[in-house]
């Protein structure tokens, strides 16, 4: 069933992961370094999915992702044979009001105690992930081990 | 069975409004699952969306027509209506009013179909 | 122009097997949408064939199937009958649209 009440504005958030790195906009990508002085991590733009009838169930709250104030959304899409992290230029509002859910644009976003993971609607079993090693782009992993990072605590913004 | 009968009149003059109505019968226009819609066809071309709405009176409209497109409902009748304003003889068409059904991961597609009604833009 | 690019007309001789293309892009069929499929009789409404690419509503003949890769849909009849002779539309989602999209409809011949 949609959801009756329409919301005007997404929710902002702040993101970290578990060693205390921020996601930081360069060249038009995101990264993931240790916060320091002076430094601008990005703030999070989040929505819920209206349609979430026609989603997966029990997965996790489907939600789009974007960068606030910067009309910049994440989406998942295939290079080759490879699903790949990307952003586009998008407004978040736009993909909330469309009468389909935008499965490349889409999240489900699952919390467990005070971590987050976000694992790709269009591709399930593919996660937002950041290398362990730190200062790499955003990535989309398969792979819940070491050498990746797919825990993030959300803060929200009030 | 679900059925749908499109009704309003067959002629409208330019610069002014179209009207129809839908008047569903055999079921519910209040099911939490289905949208219901319309859909256009000019004569001998193909289908367009114009838009739909839920029972709540959540509405989404083909974004090229949307200025002009209102539809409404009314559950304690089991209809839903269609307006659009200032039509043109581009507007010529038969009108289709649909149920819009879901399936999880798959787009809403249009089931059953009314019969359709002819409308034509002419002074 | 329509969004989804079908051929204008297809034919075929009785008990032949014909297929009709939808042909879209990375914004609609590319983008996880699925493909839907009606038919429109001649002076009728169009009638639900094919949904979510593959599935067939009860009362719909198996000589009707449908598949999707990538960007592009079919619809296939085989077994061809006088009575299949109709219009074909497929339909889908377009997001950079925000609407419900169709091919701009193929015409079937049974020779």
């Known amino acids: 069933m949609e959801k009756a009440l329409k919301i005007d504005t997404p929710q902002q958030g702040s993101i970290q992961d578990i060693n205390h790195r921020v996601w930081v906009l360069q060249d038009q990508t995101l990264i993931a370094v240790p916060r320091k002085d002076r430094m601008s991590p990005v703030t999070i733009a989040l929505i819920s999915c209206r349609h979430v009838e026609t989603l997966e169930k029990d997965r996790g709250n489907p939600i789009y992702l974007g960068l606030n104030g910067l009309n910049l959304c994440l989406m998942c899409a295939k290079v080759g044979d490879q699903p790949t992290l990307q952003l586009k230029e998008k407004d978040i509002m736009d993909l909330y009001n469309q009468p389909e859910p935008v499965k490349s644009f889409l999240f489900y976003h699952s919390q467990s105690g005070r971590n987050s993971t976000f694992e790709s609607v269009a591709f399930p079993g593919w996660f937002i992930a950041v290398s362990s090693e730190g200062g790499c782009p955003l990535i989309l992993t398969q792979e819940l081990g070491k050498a990746n990072t797919t825990d993030f605590g959300l803060t929200m913004l009030f | 069975e679900l059925q749908l009968q499109e009704s309003g009149p067959g002629l409208v003059k330019p610069s002014e409004t179209l009207s129809l109505t839908c008047t569903v019968s055999?079921?519910?226009?209040?099911?939490?699952?289905?949208?219901w819609g319309w859909i256009r066809q000019p004569p001998g071309k193909g289908l367009e969306w114009i838009g739909s709405?839920?029972?709540?009176?959540?509405?989404y409209y083909l974004p090229s027509l949307k200025s002009r497109v209102t539809i409404s409902v009314d559950t304690s009748k089991n209809q839903f209506s269609l307006k659009l304003s200032s039509v043109t003889a581009a507007d010529t068409a038969v009108y289709y009013c649909?149920?819009?059904?879901?399936?999880?991961?798959?787009?809403?597609?249009?089931?059953?179909w009314g019969q359709g009604t002819l409308v034509t833009v002419s002074s | 122009q329509s969004v989804l690019t079908q051929p204008p007309s297809v034919s075929g001789a009785p008990g032949q097997r014909v297929t009709i293309s939808c042909t879209g892009s990375?914004?609609?069929?590319?983008?996880?949408?699925?493909v839907h499929w009606y038919q429109q009789l001649p002076g009728t409404a169009p009638k639900l064939l094919i949904y979510?690419?593959?599935n067939r509503p009860s009362g719909v003949p198996d000589r009707f199937s449908g598949s999707k890769s990538g960007t592009s849909a079919s619809l296939a009849i085989t077994g061809l009958q006088a009575e299949d002779e109709a219009d074909y539309y497929c339909?889908?989602?377009?997001?950079?649209?925000?609407?419900?999209?169709f091919g701009g409809g193929t015409k079937l011949t049974v020779l």
């Open positions: 649909s149920r819009v059904r879901y399936g999880v991961g798959v787009p809403r597609y249009f089931d059953p």
């Open positions: 055999g079921g519910s226009i209040s099911t939490s699952s289905d949208y």
């Open positions: 709405i839920y029972y709540t009176g959540n509405t």
């Open positions: 990375s914004s609609n069929i590319g983008a996880h949408y699925d």
């Open positions: 979510g690419n593959d």
């Open positions: 339909q889908s989602y377009d997001y950079s649209l925000s609407g419900y999209v």
